[in-house]
């Protein structure tokens, strides 16, 4: 997250981290039920660990943390790497969470966000695009949903209904390491960090997010059948 601020501890209890090896964060994720996470489909890896209830970027133990393995990764069938359409994936964890003030699911928005809606994006991604600077703790950033027209003008030929753009003034954006993390609007999960230009946080190059309102049925059906 570029030019965000430290999230309040436990204010994003649905925020997850996907880890390679013992503790290398490579993507964010979102808890949507006691045993299921959402993340970006481009975050798919054969072996990874899941960390919930953690505030710090470092692997130091925190009392609220819970660690899991992913036992099933189900990318949306319409996703084709390295494209950006349908960029979401369900992950089933090896067990259910212990519900606590640090770990809680978030409800997915059934209605699509409208232009001007204020939202919160969060993650442990780099705070500077051209240098890999990482925050000490989870970062939060208020962003505004942009019109479809403005989104398409920013990225001609790259935007479809499975995406929405959101941003703020130049200098504020999600960035590398934030992929798969939550965009929460009015208390409901509206999007996942998906893509954007390089470097992050350029004028007229907003972040692009998976438009989850388009996938509510697929998410419910997939969870029910697995």
């Amino acid at each position: 997250i570029v030019n965000g601020s430290d999230c309040q501890k436990d204010a994003q209890p649905w925020q997850g981290a996907l880890l390679l090896g013992p503790n290398k964060l490579y993507c964010g994720a979102v808890l949507i039920s006691p045993q299921w996470l959402l993340t970006a489909a481009h975050c798919r890896k054969p072996v990874f660990r899941i960390r919930l209830g953690h505030h710090s970027m470092s692997p130091v133990y925190e009392s609220g943390q819970q660690m899991f393995q992913g036992i099933k990764s189900i990318p949306h069938p319409g996703y084709s790497h390295p494209g950006h359409s349908n960029d979401l994936m369900l992950i089933k964890m090896n067990r259910k969470i212990r519900d606590s003030h640090s770990v809680k699911p978030v409800e997915i928005a059934c209605d699509c966000a409208t232009e001007g809606t204020r939202c919160m994006v969060s993650g442990w991604g780099t705070t500077s695009s051209s240098h890999n600077n990482f925050p000490k703790v989870l970062q939060c950033l208020n962003i505004t949903v942009l019109s479809e027209e403005r989104c398409k003008n920013s990225y001609p030929g790259q935007i479809d209904k499975t995406m929405f753009c959101a941003g703020d003034e130049e200098g504020r954006d999600s960035c590398q390491g934030d992929s798969g993390g939550p965009v929460v609007c009015n208390g409901k999960l509206q999007g996942l960090v998906s893509w954007g230009d390089f470097p992050c946080a350029q004028r007229n190059r907003p972040g692009v997010y998976t438009n989850l309102c388009e996938f509510v049925k697929w998410i419910k059906d997939t969870m029910n059948s697995n």
């Epitope: 993507c27 970006a40 934030d178």
Partner: antibody, heavy 124, light 107 residues
């Protein structure tokens, strides 16, 4: 299948500007999934990254070459170009163009498609 | 700039043997940002491994990568005749740099 082809003069005089073009076929340059790179390799030596150009035309250069390098893109021709000014004999090398992939994960996908390279000699 | 030092400079082995190539960084590099390439004479480099341990498309499973921090390794479990080449590591954690290369030659 995506292919990259470098082209440009094989001989450049010292103090002049080296200009090379990379033509992309079998795919489109304006893609928000990819960036485009230049790399060079002096005779008998290792590889040196020169710079990248991204979807919007934003660039990222090797700090040691930054003052002399310009990478640009011509989407209408599906080409991207390298200009290296004030060349010396030390710039004699095989120059490669390549493609990389980027997203907002914290992950490096490598340079997965390369041109075959073009030799540039700097000599009077 | 992060300097990558590869060793040995040359590795003389016979087909069927195991090759272990080392890449050491002058400062810590995220393993997610390390790649390995193979280059044969007169050809462009070919991506073998990305993210320190993930094989690129079409790369046989005799090639494997490992490591973290400042020490990374490329292993070829059983050398085939077509594996004799020069191998380069690359980091993209900060301004991208390549190692000096390791030549794997037939003994």
């Amino acid at each position: 299948q995506l292919q990259l082809q470098e082209s440009g003069p094989g001989l450049v005089k010292p103090s002049e500007t080296l200009s090379l073009t990379c033509t992309v076929s079998g795919g489109s340059i304006p893609s928000s999934s990819y960036y485009w790179s230049w790399i060079r390799q002096p005779p008998g030596k290792g590889l040196e990254w020169i710079g990248n150009i991204y979807y919007s035309g934003s660039t990222y250069y090797n700090p040691s070459l930054k003052s002399r390098v310009t990478i640009s893109v011509d989407t209408s021709k599906n080409q991207f170009s390298l200009k290296l000014s004030s060349v010396t004999a030390a710039d004699t090398a095989v120059y490669y163009c390549a493609r990389g992939e980027y997203d907002r994960s914290y992950y490096y996908w490598g340079l997965d498609v390369w041109g075959q390279g073009t030799t540039v000699t700097v000599s009077s | 700039e992060i300097v990558l030092t590869q060793s040995p400079g040359t590795l003389s082995l016979s087909p069927g043997e195991r090759a272990t190539l080392s890449c050491r960084a002058s400062q810590s590099v995220s393993s997610s940002y390390l790649a390995w390439y193979q280059q044969k004479p007169g050809q462009a480099p070919r991506l073998l491994i990305y993210g320190a341990s993930s094989r690129a498309t079409g790369i046989p499973d005799r090639f494997s990568g490992s490591g973290s921090g400042t020490d990374f390794t490329l292993t070829i479990s059983r050398l085939e005749p077509e594996d004799f080449a020069v191998y380069y590591c690359q980091q993209a954690f900060s301004s991208p740099t390549f190692g000096g290369g390791t030549k794997v030659e037939i003994k």
